[in-house]
């Protein structure tokens, strides 16, 4: 329903934001070493592509009737 | 030759209603879902609703959804839209459009304002 | 809302050159049955706006094979090749994958 999906979007949403931070933190407290700068870009590259993908989750396919006739009225007129 | 024609439109004061019909000819009205988009007075399209074609199924963007219906009667070959509680921001330039966005109607003017 | 990037926002071109118009979306337009419902339109000054291409790269009846769509994911292109006077107007794009269908804020071609 989309009162559930709104509740899962909404988790998942909360959960990125603590998750995000919990890393970040982290990731502060450690030296500013090559290898701490590059798992740092590697966290922020997932949370963004994670942050990306539940954005679409939002956007509801059109309905299937509300597509392309499989025939335009156009072509139906001129046959 | 495939004709949409709107009517209906014209000027309303804010928290009014308007009822928009589209009489079509020229193709088989019953077999197609049905679209109306509209432009505002800065030139942007927006799609504002469809319905399916025996008007069991319908879809709204969500600033018009609890205020505007649309509706057909296949018989009359004609598309509605219902209108209630204008808002200014509702003031456009609306067409009929047949699924697909293939055929367009010439538009019909709406204002809202006091 | 899914957003459609328009550029450039007006063009000038001589007769006979052609002109390319950019679309980009903020996702892709894939939709769960396979296919991308993307589209280009014309609007002529005090007319409806016309459908050109359906379907990223289709042809809508009656337009002239000088019109062309291309592009996947979120690029899409509108490519007229020896453009006439009577392609001026406003270019805009759209999709119709999800809800709520969405355009772009449209391409002025003016001709020289």
């Known amino acids: 329903s989309e009162a559930e999906d709104a509740s899962l979007l909404s988790f998942m949403q909360g959960y990125m934001k603590h998750a995000t931070k919990t890393a970040k933190d982290a990731l502060s407290s450690v030296q500013e070493s090559q290898v701490a700068q590059q798992a740092r870009g590697w966290v922020t590259d997932g949370f963004s592509s994670l942050k990306d993908y539940w954005s679409t989750v939002k956007d509801k396919f059109s309905e299937f009737w509300d597509l392309d006739p499989e025939v335009r009225p156009t072509s139906a007129v001129a046959a | 030759q495939l004709q949409l024609v709107e009517s209906g439109g014209g000027l309303v004061q804010p928290g009014g209603s308007l009822r928009l019909s589209c009489a079509a000819s020229?193709?088989?009205?019953?077999?197609?879902?049905m679209r109306w988009v509209r432009q505002v007075p800065r030139k942007a399209l927006e799609w504002v609703s469809s319905?399916?074609?025996?008007?069991?199924?319908?879809a709204y963007r969500d600033s018009v959804k609890g205020r505007f219906t649309i509706s057909r009667d296949n018989a009359k070959n004609t598309l509605y839209l219902q209108m209630n509680n204008l808002k200014p921001e509702d003031t456009a330039i609306y067409y009929c459009?047949?699924?697909?966005?293939?055929?367009w109607g010439q538009g019909t003017q709406v204002t809202v304002s006091s | 809302a899914t957003m459609l990037t328009q550029s450039p926002g007006s063009l000038s071109v001589v007769p006979g050159e052609s002109a390319s118009i950019s679309c980009k979306t903020s996702?892709?337009?894939?939709?769960?049955?396979?296919?991308?419902?993307f589209y280009w339109f014309l609007q002529k000054p005090g007319q409806s706006p016309q459908q050109l291409i359906y379907?990223?790269?289709n042809r809508a009846s009656g337009v002239p094979d000088r019109f062309t769509g291309s592009g996947s994911g979120t690029d899409f292109t509108l490519k007229i090749s020896g453009v006439k006077a009577e392609d001026a107007g406003v270019y805009y794009c759209?999709?119709?994958?999800?809800?709520?269908?969405?355009f772009g804020s449209g391409t002025r071609l003016e001709i020289k």
């Open positions: 459009v047949i699924a697909g966005y293939s055929d």
């Open positions: 020229g193709f088989t009205f019953g077999t197609y879902s």
């Open positions: 319905i399916h074609t025996d008007g069991g199924g319908t």
């Open positions: 996702q892709g337009l894939v939709h769960s049955d396979g296919k991308t419902y």
């Open positions: 379907q990223v790269s």
């Open positions: 759209a999709h119709g994958t999800y809800y709520p269908h969405t």
